[in-house]
Interface confidence: medium
């Protein structure tokens, strides 16, 4: 039988009455246009909803928008359009919500053609009040907050000027012209690229990379011949044009661009691209596109300096620059990532790594599923996960995979069971151990969300017809209850719950349609009375993450340490609560050669864990330079994998070698850098 229909599924007592008392409907007095929703702050209960409706007239498009505010997690909304003087808000800029709990909101208004500049509405009290400010420029991008100080904003203008505000958008100053891309770094630093001649597009590959650490008082040119740049973790990356041809290479800096090293990565041609898939303070996953229009490339993982790279995964699906990749960080378990590869026969297969890209494997076939038509052997196949690529291809996949850091081990995703991703209608699968094992959770496509740190999972069927039923599970998707939240079905458009999965409220968004009218409507359901009591110590059980062989003393060791978590028992129906903190007990593992990667000039022969010196370095395609100048590379051939905490055990110490290596190219060397002040 389907999951949730088994005899042993116990029902949550009196849940219909409990949920009915906690279901709140709000009908918006709106024609159905588009709706966008933003949470303001963490655990504040404040939601802003912007509805926009375009009326196409003969000569122009007339727009109308309304702004609503809730301060009780969406149970009730108040029309606050008058606070923004009934102005039409530009949805393409969205609602710029300030970092952390700053309570700051910026809305960008539509202005008439001949105006000198744009207009914004600013709030610093969680949208209780707004101040109208006329800008001295027309914004090209949404206002960007400094992560360190929410009073500092930057924006690019339609004329490629870089504008900065130091008082939350009250006053603006143009600090540089001819700017292509600008990003906040750490410590209120701004990095940006500039063009000298024609335009951003014309000067691609001849841009300069600049830095200001004092909001535009002084500048330093930290790179030339730049194609693009990116920030990831503590790394600053720049792709730089080669001197002789049209290829470019990645350079990396860990000191905000003062010194650079060439990354040991292949160079790419005009039609290719680099992409930072994921980065933290330890390391980076980098995708390097294959030559030609193949739709795939190679994933490399870096060392702790971002310089030496190990090949992690071949034939990694990534369609084009800014295109689709299924690369997903499973945030509910350390070291786990899921992505797709394009196999030789052009089929797409899902791969998973549990050790931060060290090894990739197929996903284990769910126990309660049979192999589909893509499988050659009906008894041997894998689970394949639908993510961004499937969604872009308009498969019946309403949602990407979902995991939450505080819902330990839980991963929910659409998938199919076979030799490759299938075009057939997918089902929803769940893993409770970070992707090692999977179970079919729901039949057919669904929207899903995690509440109360995993204590409740909520789902709504992805249907062609209006819906009025929501499903929920209190045991990590094993058993499901259904609740009819309204007598009158609605055309469903989305599920909304507070980011962070700590809330017990879910909002169901949709619209009602009759012969003449069509209105937005939301239903907010509070599950607090389903989870009647607070969880106690007895409700939790000890769980060893990454456990595959309990007999092995090193069981659970990943990146040099193992972690035991306190996990809520599936049978416990109780509240983790908003203040729930994941309890984990780490213990250090003994080192093995697996905890080390091969340093520059060394490699691992196949089926061998030892690093062997490369016989020939001269003319090697992956040359690189340390700190932007000639350098004695001293190495014993091994470097500990970034983030690896192992101690004792194998210590691969051997004679330290000097690899005298001439820098053949370093376009970002210090002598090419300069400083200037405004």
């Amino acid at each position: 039988s389907a999951p949730g229909e088994d005899e042993e599924c116990g029902r949550v007592r009196d849940f219909v009455a409990k949920l009915a008392n906690n279901t709140h409907q709000h009908v918006f007095d709106d024609l159905r246009g588009s709706v966008s929703l933003s949470w303001v702050g963490d655990s504040t209960g404040v939601i802003l909803v912007l509805t926009t409706f375009h009326v196409p007239l003969v000569i122009m498009t007339f727009g109308q928008s309304k702004l609503y505010r809730s301060e009780d997690y969406g149970k009730n909304f108040k029309d606050i359009t008058d606070l923004i003087n009934n102005t039409f808000i530009r949805t393409e800029f969205g609602m710029a919500i300030g970092p952390e709990n700053s309570g700051k909101v910026v809305l960008t208004a539509e202005v008439s053609g001949g105006s000198r500049g744009g207009r914004i509405f600013r709030s610093s009290d969680f949208a209780k009040n707004f101040v109208q400010t006329d800008l001295p420029f027309h914004p090209l991008t949404q206002m960007m907050y400094s992560p360190q100080n929410s009073d500092y904003l930057l924006a690019l203008s339609t004329e490629n000027g870089l504008w900065v505000s130091k008082n939350f958008g009250g006053k603006w100053e143009e600090i540089h012209k001819a700017v292509c891309l600008a990003k906040w770094g750490s410590d209120n630093t701004i990095f940006f690229t500039t063009y000298a001649n024609g335009s951003c597009k014309a000067d691609l590959g001849a841009l300069e990379l600049w830095r200001t650490s004092d909001l535009g008082k002084s500048f330093k040119t930290i790179g030339v011949k730049i194609y693009s740049f990116g920030l990831g973790g503590r790394f600053l990356f720049a792709s730089v044009m080669a001197d002789k041809d049209t290829t470019r290479r990645i350079h990396v800096s860990t000191d905000q661009g003062d010194t650079w090293s060439m990354a040991q990565l292949p160079s790419v041609g005009q039609e290719q691209f680099y992409s930072i898939l994921a980065a933290n303070d330890d390391m980076v996953f980098m995708h390097v596109d294959e030559p030609g229009d193949t739709g795939f490339g190679t994933i490399f993982t870096s060392d702790d300096r971002g310089i030496v790279y190990s090949k992690s995964l071949d034939r990694h699906l990534y369609t084009t620059t800014g295109g689709e990749t299924d690369f997903t960080n499973v945030t509910s378990l350390r070291g786990v990532y899921i992505t797709s590869v394009l196999s030789e026969d052009n089929s797409i297969q899902t791969m998973i790594t549990f050790d931060q890209g060290g090894r990739w494997t197929h996903l284990r076939k769910p126990e309660n599923s049979e192999c589909d038509a893509t499988a050659k052997n009906k008894n041997e196949c894998s689970l394949h996960i639908h993510a961004s690529y499937s969604i872009s291809q308009k498969l019946n996949v309403p949602m990407a995979p979902l995991s939450e850091p505080n819902a330990v081990g839980i991963v929910i995703a659409h998938g199919s069971v076979g030799d490759a991703i299938s075009v057939m209608v997918p089902d929803v699968y769940i893993s409770d151990d970070g992707g090692y094992s999977w179970t079919k959770m729901l039949e057919g496509p669904h929207y899903y969300t995690i509440l109360d740190s995993g204590g409740i999972i909520v789902a709504i069927e992805h249907s062609s017809r209006p819906i009025n039923v929501i499903k929920f599970s209190t045991d990590e998707g094993q058993c499901w209850q259904t609740y009819t939240f309204t007598r009158d079905p609605i055309y469903f458009t989305g599920l909304a719950s507070e980011p962070g999965a700590r809330s017990m409220n879910i909002s169901i968004w949709g619209f009602t349609e009759s012969f003449l009218t069509s209105q937005w409507v939301s239903y907010t359901i509070d599950f607090k009375d389903i989870l009647e009591r607070n969880c106690e110590e007895k409700d939790y059980t000890i769980w060893l993450a990454h456990s595959t062989d309990p007999e092995d003393y090193e069981d659970g060791c990943i990146l040099g340490y193992k972690e035991q978590f306190l996990r809520l028992r599936k049978s416990s129906v109780c509240q983790n609560g908003r203040d729930y903190v994941v309890t984990k007990q780490p213990s250090i593992c003994l080192c093995s050669l697996e905890d080390f990667l091969c340093d520059f000039g060394y490699y691992r022969p196949e089926n061998d864990s030892k690093c062997v010196e490369q016989p020939e370095l001269k003319g090697h395609d992956l040359e690189f330079c340390l700190y932007g100048r000639e350098e004695h590379l001293t190495t014993n051939g091994y470097r500990k994998i970034p983030g690896d905490k192992c101690q004792g055990g194998v210590n691969p110490v051997r004679e330290v070698k000097d690899l005298k290596k001439k820098c053949t190219s370093n376009f970002l060397s210090p002598e090419k850098q300069n400083s200037k002040s405004n």
Partner: antibody
């Protein structure tokens, strides 16, 4: 109007291959999958496989695995079905059929399985020595 | 694969009468089921999709019901043009499969 026009009848010898074309018009070719269905004389309908015109990915029924190849040419909005190693029991009318099969169409009420809503006129393939 | 079984194989009905056709799936296909009508020498024509939704241009006398494993196609008052073969088809799990068909003939 939306239509699928298939190539003409074919007579083939056992062991040979046949390639049937199906040209789509009246809608955005890449917005729908295409299924192939065959019907032997006096028999019921048999699904052979499906192709996604966007990426060209395919899924074939186990019975035809290794013998069937479905391809598409987006420049001419045409899908092709090639069946190799023909035998007498492959004598049938072959249909292409537009198949949403899970494509989320534009608009809110456009999800789920919509059935094969447009069919080609059929191509008769006779396998005889 | 999911096996679709239609019954009866032949149904003899007089014009104006009600016809009820049954389709059973070997496992749940949810509501991923379609019904087709086929007349001699013609391609099949979609009647019902999503188990119960009439396709564009299909008269109201055709209705579909059911979910999971049991499905029914009902023709409330048979017209002369309704005498044909009817097939059900699931699109729940690959490969798509059709039922063997029910021939509706004049009594």
């Amino acid at each position: 109007q939306v239509q699928l026009v298939q190539s003409g009848a074919e007579v083939k010898k056992p062991g040979a291959s046949v390639k049937v074309s199906c040209k789509a018009s009246g809608y955005t070719f890449t917005s729908r999958y295409m299924s192939w269905v065959r019907q032997a004389p006096g028999q019921g309908l048999e699904w052979m496989g499906i192709i996604n015109p966007v990426g060209g990915s395919t899924s074939y029924a186990q019975k035809f695995q290794g013998r069937v190849t479905m391809t598409r040419d987006t420049s001419t909005s045409t899908v092709y079905m090639e069946l190799s190693s023909l035998r007498s029991e492959d004598t049938a009318v072959y249909y292409c059929a537009r198949d949403p099969s899970g494509i989320a169409l534009a608009g809110p009420a456009s999800r789920g399985y919509y059935g094969m809503d447009v069919w080609g006129q059929g191509t008769t393939v006779t396998v005889s020595s | 694969e999911i096996v679709m079984t239609q019954s009866p194989a032949t149904l003899s009905v007089s014009p104006g009468e009600r016809a009820t056709l049954s389709c059973r799936a070997s496992q749940s296909v949810s509501s991923n089921l379609a019904w087709y009508q086929q007349k001699p020498g013609q391609a099949p024509r979609l009647l019902i999709y999503g188990a119960s939704t009439r396709a564009t241009g299909i008269p109201a006398r055709f209705s579909g019901s059911g979910s999971g494993t049991e499905f029914t196609l009902t023709i409330s008052s048979l017209q002369s043009e309704d005498f044909a073969v009817y097939y059900c088809q699931q699109a729940r799990l690959g490969p798509w499969t059709f039922g063997g068909g029910t021939k509706v003939e004049i009594k």
